[in-house]
């Protein structure tokens, strides 16, 4: 009774198409698969950034797989062939592992990389990224930003840099068509006559870094003798109403501070007839229905009412 064996996949490699971290892992079928013509061979692929504690694992029938990687670090991957139990009259058979690695040969010391990279997608319309120059780099150092997301043929360079003392410290991006809800990759590299500059790689999804405008048109309406309805409008721009959460801060007679988080453009406040002054501010953020994360807007302008009788009228300023 001969033991069934299978070879590992051939020509296993990691291919960098120049998309700043979006890599292709590809391989060819193992040698000597003739005995298993009726069988669908599967592959178990494991990969990770070097230094990571855990492997990501994929089981696939394909001969390729694509994913995003942190090119600040190296990448290691391994793959083996799986013969399902249906092919072997019993238990699953696995080949030995085929292994490969990939890294971008680093230039310059780590301190020359940009620091404190931050990107904000203002009002779901305008992307702006900013950074600080690396430690100890000279003023002749210039940084360049490149970006790519699925839909672009190749990585593009920033064309509108923000400068300080002649150095690029940020990028204002052009209109980015069909660019949200997908991984957006960035590389900031640099050049200096003095010394080589280390590149930095980043990724994000645009909808997760949105900072909306603050809400507008804050109003008060007396609902009953002890209730006032606070209302506001969604900020101008492309973000639909269903995508907002709001935080309200209310001050009553300079003493009571109420804070609340709500999903609609209204909040009903219990008051007493003695209330002399009411002020509130609101800010907005993209909610969990439209993103995994988001940045609070600035606070709206403060809306206040001072006067004798809150019960008499709708208060609109």
């Amino acid at each position: 009774d001969t033991e069934i064996k299978v070879n590992p996949p051939q020509d296993f490699e990691i291919v960098d198409p120049g998309y700043l971290g979006y890599l292709y892992l590809q391989w060819q079928p193992p040698l000597s698969l003739d005995h298993f013509k009726e069988c669908t061979v599967e592959y178990e692929l494991k990969y990770r950034n070097i230094g990571s504690e855990t492997w990501k694992t994929i089981i696939t029938k394909n001969l390729h797989y694509k994913d995003g990687f942190d090119l600040n670090k190296g990448i290691e991957a391994k793959i083996h062939t799986l013969l399902p139990w249906q092919c072997t009259n019993g238990s699953e058979v696995q080949s030995s592992w085929a292994e490969t690695t990939y890294w971008i040969s680093p230039q310059g010391i780590p301190e020359t990389k940009v620091q404190d990279m931050d990107c904000v997608y203002y009002n779901w319309q305008y992307l702006l990224c900013s950074w600080k120059p690396g430690i100890g780099v000279l003023l002749d150092t210039n940084y360049n930003l490149f970006y790519w997301y699925e839909g672009l043929d190749h990585a593009l360079q920033c064309v509108d840099y923000i400068k300080a003392d002649g150095q690029n410290i940020g990028c204002r991006f052009p209109y980015l068509e069909a660019s949200d809800y997908k991984d957006f990759y960035i590389c900031v590299n640099g050049s200096s006559e003095n010394k080589p500059i280390r590149s930095s790689y980043f990724t994000f999804q645009l909808q997760n870094i949105v900072k909306p405008l603050p809400p507008v048109y804050l109003t008060f309406t007396r609902e009953s003798s002890c209730e006032i309805k606070l209302k506001w409008s969604i900020p101008l721009g492309p973000i639909p109403a269903r995508c907002f959460d709001y935080e309200i801060e209310i001050r009553e007679d300079d003493t009571t501070l109420v804070t609340a988080t709500v999903e609609n453009e209204t909040y009903t406040l219990k008051t007493t007839n003695e209330t002399r002054q009411l002020c509130f501010v609101v800010r907005s953020k993209v909610n969990i229905y439209c993103s995994d994360d988001g940045i609070w807007s600035e606070w709206s302008d403060k809306q206040c009412w001072e006067g004798e009788d809150l019960s008499k009228k709708t208060l609109l300023r």
Epitope: D116, F204, I209, D293
Partner: nanobody
């Protein structure tokens, strides 16, 4: 160069408290998500608590109500206040940061973090 250095571990009795601190250098912690993880010898590293750049926090069910994660932006440290400690909290505790993904939500998955400290040992025993 990014560096994360944990401190504050030690031996504590059940029911006691400890505060772990993670000092970050080479970047501003307020811009990125960070987390605390722990690992027993021979076991998988598990998420304990994490915070994103907007200050939102998440906790493992086993530590909810007992542990608190907070960032001290002035000192550039990430702290973990641990109260009502139990013997099962004994482990090596690691601080981690994700400097690659900008604006991603807090996560307790080790695969979401690329930079790690060396760890500090916490032992809960009478």
């Amino acid at each position: 160069q990014v560096q994360l250095v944990e401190s504050g571990g030690g031996l504590v009795q059940p029911g006691g408290s400890l505060t772990l601190s993670c000092a970050a250098s080479g970047y501003r912690i307020s811009l990125y998500k960070m987390g605390w993880f722990r690992q027993d010898p021979g076991k998988q590293r598990e998420g304990v608590a994490a915070v994103d750049r907007n200050g939102r926090t998440i906790y493992a069910d086993s530590v909810k109500g007992r542990f608190t994660i907070y960032q001290d932006n002035a000192k550039n440290t990430l702290d973990l206040q641990m109260n009502s400690l139990k013997p099962e909290d004994t482990a090596m505790y690691y601080c981690a940061a994700d400097l690659w993904r900008i604006g991603s939500p807090a996560s307790l998955s080790p695969t979401d973090y690329g930079d790690w400290g060396q760890g500090t040992q916490v032992t809960v025993s009478s």
